[in-house]
């Protein structure tokens, strides 16, 4: 637009002029005026501020609490907040990984489609016909049920979702 | 304070190219656009175009629509101005300057608060 | 594209006189209109914005009026370091264009 009608992109409007934002990582001071230009600060250590801005306090960096399960994934900046992530067997609660909880396990006969992270918990499936789980676990996959036909055997026990196929010698009495 | 301080001056042959620097301090760089102005020895004042140092976008006048090139790098605070194709009257100094905005009566007012002190670049066989 | 038609183009003057320059704009620009002040071998200095806004550390001798397509710089009483070529540059449409310039001499 010719000519302007607003203050450019990184611009803030405070009396009557159009002042420059802090740049990520630091915080304001003082506003522009006729004579002087914008002032701003580089955030203190464990503070951060990650957009343009006109902010007079830069925020804290997120604490990554171990009492909670927490543990720092990636060191915050001036720029950037601190990333926390869950320890070992456990995954966070929300989006915002504020606590932790132990990751699920899938119970008999169900198995494992998706493996636990940091963020997000283990996703069971019921074991489909011809497969079965016999454990509590948060890792093992529906195992398939033995081929008693390759062993040259004969299922003596159907098999579950839960348990496997018993195979036994076949009839020789039979014709 | 603020300051805009230009390279220094060049002599170029026709169909050459110059690239003018324009190093500013004092300000955020990326917070206020740059135009560029030129000169022809006691002549007036030709405006040329702008960059938004934030995103690195540019806006030509059309008379210098596919010949000048306007860029930026944020990391050194420094915007440039490459014309090509030079002709002698290309010949001028050419200047950088800081938009200001003003709101006044509901409307956004720019001007150019400040200016680097010129590059003169000659262009001659 | 607009046309800026300053004048005078030359005009010599005296210390302590009472200076005008106009500046008449080929279309209408409502009050986008700014003043330059530029001596030998220097770069031009923003002395009014706005058509009449005084620009931070500039002289209260300086005063800028009008708008739509006729403007004017009055300087009050010259100074000698007033001595100097001024250009209005309108800011309402592409390209921004100046004024050819005023130069002001002694007399």
């Known amino acids: 637009p010719e000519p302007p009608t607003a203050c450019r992109e990184k611009q803030y409007l405070i009396n009557s002029q159009c002042c420059s934002l802090c740049q990520p990582g630091q915080k304001l001071v003082s506003d522009c005026t006729e004579f002087t230009e914008t002032e701003c600060l580089p955030c203190g250590e464990s503070e951060f501020l990650d957009t343009w801005n006109r902010e007079t306090h830069c925020h804290q960096h997120k604490y990554c609490d171990p009492n909670l399960g927490l543990r720092v994934q990636q060191k915050g900046t001036s720029e950037t907040d601190t990333i926390c992530t869950c320890e070992e067997g456990w995954h966070c609660t929300s989006e915002a990984c504020e606590s932790c909880v132990l990751h699920r396990s899938c119970s008999p006969g169900f198995g494992v489609k998706q493996i636990a992270t940091g963020v997000s918990d283990t996703i069971c499936e019921p074991c489909p016909v011809g497969f079965f789980s016999n454990v509590s676990s948060a890792f093992e996959k529906c195992h398939p049920w033995t081929s008693c036909e390759t062993k040259d055997l004969v299922v003596q026990q159907a098999g579950t979702n839960k348990t496997d196929v018993v195979c036994g010698p076949q009839d020789r009495l039979r014709a | 304070q603020v300051q805009l301080v230009q390279s220094g001056a060049e002599v170029k042959k026709p169909g050459a190219s110059v690239k003018v620097s324009c190093k500013a301090s004092?300000?955020?760089?990326?917070?206020?656009?740059m135009y560029w102005v030129r000169q022809a020895p006691g002549q007036g004042l030709e405006w040329m175009g702008w960059?938004?140092?934030?995103?690195?976008?540019?806006t030509y006048a059309q008379k210098f629509q596919g010949r000048v090139t306007m860029t930026r790098d944020t990391s050194i605070s420094t915007a440039y101005m490459e014309l090509s194709r030079l002709r002698s009257d290309d010949t001028a100094v050419y200047y950088c300057?800081?938009?200001?905005?003003?709101?006044?009566?509901?409307?956004?007012?720019?001007?150019?608060?400040?200016w680097g002190q010129g590059t003169l670049v000659t262009v001659s066989s | 594209d607009i046309q800026l038609t300053q004048s005078p183009s030359f005009l010599s003057a005296s210390v302590g006189d009472r200076v005008t320059i106009t500046c008449r704009a080929s279309?209408?620009?409502?009050?986008?209109l700014a003043w330059y002040q530029q001596k030998p071998g220097k770069a031009p200095k923003l002395l009014i914005y706005?058509?009449?806004t005084l620009q931070s550390g500039v002289p209260s001798r300086f005063s800028g009026s009008g708008s739509g397509t006729e403007f004017t710089l009055t300087i009050s009483s010259l100074q000698p370091e007033d001595f100097a070529t001024y250009y209005c540059?309108?800011?309402?449409?592409?390209?921004?264009?100046f004024g050819q310039g005023t130069k002001v001499e002694i007399k």
């Open positions: 300057a800081r938009e200001k905005i003003y709101y006044g009566s509901g409307n956004y007012y720019p001007s150019f608060d400040y």
């Open positions: 004092g300000y955020t760089f990326a917070g206020y656009y």
């Open positions: 960059i938004n140092p934030d995103s690195g976008a540019p």
């Open positions: 279309q209408g620009i409502s009050s986008y």
């Open positions: 706005a058509a009449s």
């Open positions: 540059q309108q800011l309402d449409s592409y390209p921004w264009t």
